[in-house]
Interface confidence: low
């Protein structure tokens, strides 16, 4: 609901005449840029030459709103672009999985106080790249070969580990047969069971496998680190507060 109100307010701001007379700021943009189809590109604008406070930045493609970065509410990506648009870096915008249809003008609209609105223009051209296609033709068989090699290696390792365990199990069985019979009623730990409490293999924020060989403390730190990253990425946009 608040985003609906914000969008209405933003449109109003866009059409409103500037209240202040003198605008000293300039917008620096990445200018005219080109990128390959299927790739990604960062659109960046920077407002300089002014001490005005930025309250909101709108990113628009022709007449479509892509995203809003509001000082209080943070980022909002337009639902129709959610899958392909990522906020940042900074007040910039990252466009992913580019198509030829993405070719065109992009605008960064800075709403500032007391200056008013500044607009920067970027022209993006998305190219059909024969080089990219040529590279892909070589990459696919290569990836296939690598994957096959990996599967063979993993299979070999699993077989060796299984045989080693079998031998150990036979030795243990012959020596400790009586003990095993005595404790047959007790539940045995199985490798498929969830990791015991305190284990960090299941730390949601950290990528799987990073903590396999590490001590608990290290993994806790890593978990915290990734939580900090996700917290920062969910935070408000980077708007300035004058501290001088």
């Amino acid at each position: 609901m608040r985003w609906c109100l914000l969008l209405i307010w933003a449109q109003g701001l866009r059409q409103a005449p500037l209240a202040s007379g003198m605008m000293t700021g300039t917008i620096e943009t990445t200018g005219n840029i080109s990128a390959e189809k299927g790739g990604s590109i960062i659109l960046q604008c920077h407002l300089s030459s002014t001490t005005a406070q930025v309250t909101q930045v709108n990113w628009e493609q022709q007449d479509q709103l892509l995203a809003i970065c509001n000082a209080d509410l943070g980022w909002h990506i337009s639902p129709s672009f959610k899958d392909r648009v990522a906020p940042g870096p900074g007040l910039g915008l990252t466009l992913q999985s580019l198509t030829v249809n993405d070719t065109g003008e992009y605008f960064c609209i800075y709403h500032t106080y007391p200056d008013g609105t500044y607009t920067g223009r970027i022209f993006l051209e998305v190219l059909e790249s024969s080089v990219a296609e040529h590279g892909a033709r070589f990459q696919i068989p290569l990836l296939g070969a690598m994957a096959a090699t990996l599967v063979v290696i993993c299979t070999a390792v699993i077989v060796v580990v299984a045989l080693t365990r079998k031998k150990k199990a036979l030795r243990i069985h012959s020596v400790e047969g009586d003990l095993r019979r005595k404790s047959a009623g007790q539940e045995e730990w199985s490798p498929s069971a969830p990791s015991p409490p305190g284990s960090c293999v299941q730390a949601e924020a950290a990528p799987a496998g990073l903590c396999g060989e590490q001590r608990g403390e290290d993994c806790a730190e890593l978990h915290d680190y990734f939580n900090v990253l996700s917290y920062r990425s969910l935070g408000n946009c980077s708007f300035f507060t004058e501290t001088g």
């Epitope: 620096e28 920077h46 300089s48 930025v54 940042g88 870096p89 900074g90 920062r232 935070g235 408000n236 946009c237 980077s238 708007f239 300035f240 507060t241 004058e242 501290t243 001088g244």
Partner: nanobody
Framework: EVQLVESGGGLVQPGGSLRLSCAAS????????MGWFRQAPGKEREFVAS???????FYADSVKGRFTISADNSKNTAYLQMNSLKPEDTAVYYC????????????WGQGTLVTVSS
Amino acid sequence: EVQLVESGGGLVQPGGSLRLSCAASGFTFSTSWMGWFRQAPGKEREFVASISTSGNTFYADSVKGRFTISADNSKNTAYLQMNSLKPEDTAVYYCAADVWYGSTWRNWGQGTLVTVSS
């Protein structure tokens, strides 16, 4: 913690030169926009010059051709070379950095006083 420390200010005669330095710490200097602003007694703070991450420079009309902004990424320091100084350049000069971190954008130094007088 972001820190900006200006130095190089002082008293200089009209037509003279000064070089201001801004030592930065607590952030990735090479990916941050840097600028110089100034505030004369009884006036509002105004833009002087800036250098973007791509190396593009901007100048206020009043200092164009006389002042030069530069940055040394290896030393995490921004500079403002001021030549042909005029009495109207007298002000406290502030270094500013736009840091993409948390909810703070523009960070300011404490300022260094430049006095142009005979």
